[in-house]
Amino acid sequence: TPEVWVQVRMEATELSSFTIRCGFLGSGSISLVTVSWGGPNGAGGTTLAVLHPERGIRQWAPARQARWETQSSISLILEGSGASSPCANTTFCCKFASFPEGSWEACGSLPPSSDPGLSAPPTPAPILRAD
């Protein structure tokens, strides 16, 4: 079965800056990736970025530098310390739409005791939804 992994890391140099990495462990071709925070899209979350293999990338503040790392993984940086910025216990979710598997989504957050510069291991977080 396909799985999605989510890794959240707080940058040592900028305590209000996070790096989010997500990947899809499956054999299908990915048609769209949606990254959200505060929960899954459609369940109280806010879209941070959408990445499409051909149609490009859109990101919304405080997201920066959303990009494909490989054909099946993406990363983005969250910056800033304003009211619309994440805190240490924020949940980040990644949803991968692929063919023929369908949509798979997982969420993750910063480990409770993580030091700046350390990251959560890229665990396949619980699959929240498979459409």
Epitope: N41, G44, G45, R55, R58, S84
Partner: antibody
Framework: QVQLQQSGPELVKPGTSVKISCKAS????????INWVKQRPGQGLEWIGW????????YYNEKFKGRATLTVDKSSSTAYMLLSSLTSEDSAVYFC????????????WGQGTTLTVSS | DIQMTQSPSSLSASLGGKVTITCKAS??????IAWFQHKPGKGPRLLIH???TLQSGIPSRFSGSGSGGDYSFSISNLEPEDIATYYC????????FGGGTTLEIK
């Protein structure tokens, strides 16, 4: 088809507040950012801020922080902008616009709401 | 904040002719620029996004190009209905509009 229908013109006194509405139809309201844009008479367009209806999360242009408040009512697919402590500088046409994501920014617009602040 | 400098502020051209408008960003905006047509009493209309992608239903007389901080927008074979004000918008980070260009037909 996608439509954004804004409330009618407003004539208000300085120092008061006004709430402008933007009713969305023809798409899933909670999936797309709604932006608000200001246009003063004879001038250009100025971005005020956005709200993501699915979560209510907002982001404001620094210039409008504390003066504009964006909210949504998911049950009626309506976005609102409250402008407070009004002055003559707030007299303008205000537009709501959907951000279409990969389809492009501000792909659908409301028709505009004219606000006149005068004593 | 990213600033957008649009020029010219107004221009006049003949029917059937071609016009070009430029927008200069204060930093690299990674091709995240859109162009809008705005007519009085209406909401603006998205013509082009991501520098050169034509919005659905927009005629190919409209085109865009550029990279880094320098972008241009052109209308060829000008028609009477092209009379409007045109704006660029950067959306690489948040949003900033250019000052606008008012197009008149000679």
């Amino acid at each position: 088809q996608v439509q954004l229908q804004q409330s009618g013109p407003e004539l208000v006194k300085p120092g008061t507040s006004v709430k402008i509405s933007c009713k969305a139809s023809g798409y899933t309201f909670t999936d797309y950012y709604i932006n608000w844009v200001k246009q003063r008479p004879g001038q250009g367009l100025e971005w005020i801020g956005w709200i993501f209806p699915g979560s209510g999360n907002t982001y404001y242009n620094e210039k409008f922080k504390g003066r504009a408040t964006l909210t949504v009512d998911k049950s009626s697919s309506t976005a609102y902008m409250l402008l407070s402590s009004l002055t003559s500088e707030d007299s303008a046409v205000y537009f709501c616009a959907r951000d279409g994501g990969l389809r492009g920014p501000f792909d659908y617009w409301g028709q505009g709401t004219t606000l006149t602040v005068s004593s | 904040d990213i600033q957008m400098t649009q020029s010219p502020s107004s221009l006049s051209a003949s029917l059937g002719g071609k016009v070009t408008i430029t927008c200069k960003a204060s930093q690299d905006i990674n091709k995240y620029i859109a162009w809008f047509q705005h007519k009085p009493g209406k909401g603006p209309r998205l013509l082009i996004h991501f520098t050169s992608t034509l919005q659905s239903g927009i005629p190919s007389r409209f085109s865009g190009s550029g990279s880094g901080g320098d972008y241009s927008f052109s209308i060829s074979n000008l028609e009477p209905e092209d009379i409007a004000t045109y704006y660029c918008l950067q959306y690489d980070y948040l949003y900033t509009f250019g000052g606008g260009t008012t197009l008149e037909i000679k």
